[in-house]
Interface confidence: low
């Protein structure tokens, strides 16, 4: 969902702009840029809106199904464990919850893109907030995982394992609390607006451009740059330590978390680069013209779609990179499918190192 889907005829204050570039009355997507800043009425968005109408519903429907199945499987595997979850597994469970909640909103945004918002202002606020809460939660939880691994391996500080289990729960609660705080603008400014130009209702923000730019910057920094920096810093140090200590098993064990982080970076970087271009246009650092604006709108749709794919990607990564996850998933399916044939199951090793399918600590690691 791209919440910034806007009117066709916009005085889109970058601040406003009736106004922002030269283009002909027939609305050709001219590249002429004006030094006086304000020489024409707003850009049409027919192309980007038609693109959204065709592209987003199909993508969101697919991601909804994949995300629900995949993250449901992850949650099921983790919750089926008899032993207490490790810190990383707890974070991964919360991550699966965040991803599931995010994909649950996608059908609503699919309807919004295809037709209009038919669910009222209340659900618009909730869906928008839920969407952003889980967008931020996904990024912050990945940062938490990397920080946990960093303390665990680089400083040999098992922050969560030795201490009370409440510590990891408190961290997760803090993450969710922070995400709720970040989503406050959604509760306040999102509502179902009847767009007279399109003769349709859409779930959109209605606040000054300054606020919108601030929100985009917050999303860029808190939801992407900061978590990415934390991840990069932590994993760089972890890899350095593991390479020096020649801990091959632990290097193998690191594979999953590294792949998850790389996936996060690959999935979300394009979208945030587009958002950065948008911010620069809002701030006037990049000249706004109709051609560029239209391309940015379409790029935002495509790259946000790529970003939301990340919600479905984690379960696939666990399945293909995480040996233990595949094993436990298989066992769970067997248990669900053949309740009276438990003797057929390959019993998991009872060793301590099997306590987690993602952990990479001194006390516990798995050959992922």
């Amino acid at each position: 969902m791209v919440l910034e889907v806007s009117d066709h005829q916009v005085l889109n204050d970058a601040e406003v702009a009736a106004l922002l570039e030269n283009f002909s009355s027939s609305y050709d997507y001219g590249e002429n840029e004006s030094d006086s800043c304000c020489t024409s009425p707003p850009c049409p968005q027919d192309f980007s809106l038609n693109f959204d109408r065709a592209f987003l519903p199909a993508l969101y429907s697919l991601l909804f199904l994949l995300g629900l199945l995949g993250n449901g499987a992850v949650a099921a595997v983790l919750l089926s464990r008899r032993t207490a979850l490790s810190s990383t597994d707890t974070f991964l469970l919360h991550l699966a919850v965040a991803d599931t909640l995010l994909v649950l909103t996608l059908p609503l945004w699919a309807v919004d893109a295809a037709v209009q918002w038919v669910f009222g202002s209340g659900l618009c606020k909730v869906a928008g907030a839920l969407f952003n809460i889980n967008f931020y939660a996904g990024a912050l939880l990945l940062a938490c995982i990397s920080f946990d691994r960093y303390l665990n391996i680089v400083h040999a500080t098992q922050l969560y394992r030795r201490g009370p289990p409440a510590r990891v729960t408190l961290t997760c609660l803090a993450v969710w609390g922070l995400c709720l705080l970040f989503a406050l603008p959604d509760f306040i400014f999102l509502s179902a607006h009847h767009d007279e130009r399109l003769n349709a209702t859409h779930c959109q923000y209605n606040f000054p451009q300054v606020g919108r730019t601030a929100l985009r910057v917050l999303q860029l920094v808190a939801g992407f740059l900061l978590p990415l920096l934390v991840m990069a810093y932590c994993y760089a140090h972890i890899l350095a330590v593991l390479l020096v200590s020649r801990g091959q098993r632990r290097l193998r064990a690191m594979r999953l978390v590294v792949v998850v982080v790389v996936a996060f970076a690959l999935c979300w970087t394009p979208y945030h680069l587009v958002v950065l271009v948008d911010i620069l246009m809002d701030l006037g650092a990049l000249a706004r013209n109709c051609g560029r604006e239209s391309r940015v709108d379409v790029a935002k749709s495509v790259t946000s779609g790529l970003g939301y794919m990340h919600c479905c990607l984690n379960p696939l990564l666990y399945a293909f990179v995480g040996v233990k996850f595949r094993e436990r998933m298989w066992m769970l399916l067997l248990r669900l499918g053949c309740p009276n044939q438990r003797g057929l199951q390959r019993q998991p090793s009872s060793s301590r190192r099997d306590s987690s399918w993602s952990e990479t600590s001194e006390a516990s690691y798995s050959g992922l």
């Epitope: 806007s6 009117d7 005829q9 916009v10 005085l11 889109n12 204050d13 970058a14 601040e15 406003v16 702009a17 009736a18 106004l19 922002l20 002909s24 009355s25 027939s26 609305y27 800043c37 304000c38 020489t39 024409s40 009425p41 707003p42 049409p44 607006h193 009847h194 767009d195 007279e196 130009r197 003769n199 859409h202 959109q204 923000y205 209605n206 606040f207 000054p208 451009q209 300054v210 919108r212 006037g284």
Partner: antibody, heavy 123, light 106 residues
Framework: EVQLLESGGGLVQPGGSLRLSCAAS????????MSWVRQAPGKGLEWVAV????????YYPDSVKGRFTISRDNAKNTLYLQMNSLRAEDTAMYYC????????????????WGQGTLVTVSS | DIQLTQSPSFLSASVGDRVTITCRAS?????IYWYQQKPGKAPKLWIY???NLAPGVPSRFSGSGSGNEYTLTISSLQPEDFATYYC?????????FGGGTKLEIK
């Protein structure tokens, strides 16, 4: 209730200057783009200036470019039009008008108008 | 600049008449906006995006058209409808208005 109240009009000699004000109330002034539109006696409407909601962007038609300056003081909820090098053809009723907003975006027509202030340029 | 030409400039009609005012653009516009103005008063937004009636505008008013030609129609003229009507475009800068159509009682 949305209200726009213009003031500052009067009689001025050709080449002279005048500053019009428009006090806005009943809506969040900082969120709206605003314009000045004029109407010469017995004539039609002519749009003369627009300013973005934050005041960053302004635009004028060729007929007033370089002579008129639109500005706003968001703290005072007031729109201004500084008119310099006035000519006889600038004689008109000057209206301040608000651009409507939909979905956080602004439209190029006008949903609310003030009652106008008369500017007469004559020697 | 896009020139908007309204016809007729003056129109005498009686209460109950069906009246049509035309607005022609010198080059194609996407939408037309109509305003009503009564003597000594400020203009009021009447029709926007070609066919949408502004709040409080009676349903006897309608707008239509595309490209270069747009019309405002009053299905059954009422005493309060006698006023001057202006069309406006903002497809291309500068925003321009038509010369107006003065609707008078016959």
């Amino acid at each position: 209730e949305v209200q726009l109240l213009e003031s500052g009009g009067g009689l001025v000699q050709p080449g002279g200057s005048l500053r019009l004000s428009c006090a806005a109330s009943g809506f969040t002034f900082t969120s709206y783009a605003m314009s000045w539109v004029r109407q010469a006696p017995g004539k039609g409407l002519e749009w003369v200036a627009v300013i973005s909601h934050g005041g960053t962007y302004t635009y004028y038609p060729d007929s007033v470019k370089g002579r008129f300056t639109i500005s706003r003081d968001n703290a005072k909820n007031t729109l201004y039009l500084q008119m310099n090098s006035l000519r006889a053809e600038d004689t008109a009723m000057y209206y301040c008008a608000r651009h409507p907003i939909y979905s956080g975006n602004y439209q190029g027509y006008f949903d609310y108008w003030g009652q106008g202030t008369l500017v007469t340029v004559s020697s | 600049d896009i020139q908007l030409t309204q016809s007729p400039s003056f129109l005498s009609a009686s209460v109950g008449d069906r009246v049509t005012i035309t607005c022609r653009a010198s080059s194609g516009v996407n939408y037309i906006y109509w305003y009503q103005q009564k003597p000594g008063k400020a203009p009021k937004l009447w029709i926007y995006f070609t066919s949408n009636l502004a709040p409080g505008v009676p349903s006897r008013f309608s707008g239509s058209g595309s490209g270069n030609e747009y019309t405002l129609t009053i299905s059954s003229l009422q005493p309060e409808d006698f006023a001057t009507y202006y069309c406006q475009q903002f497809t291309s800068s500068p925003y321009t208005f038509g010369g107006g159509t003065k609707l008078e009682i016959k």
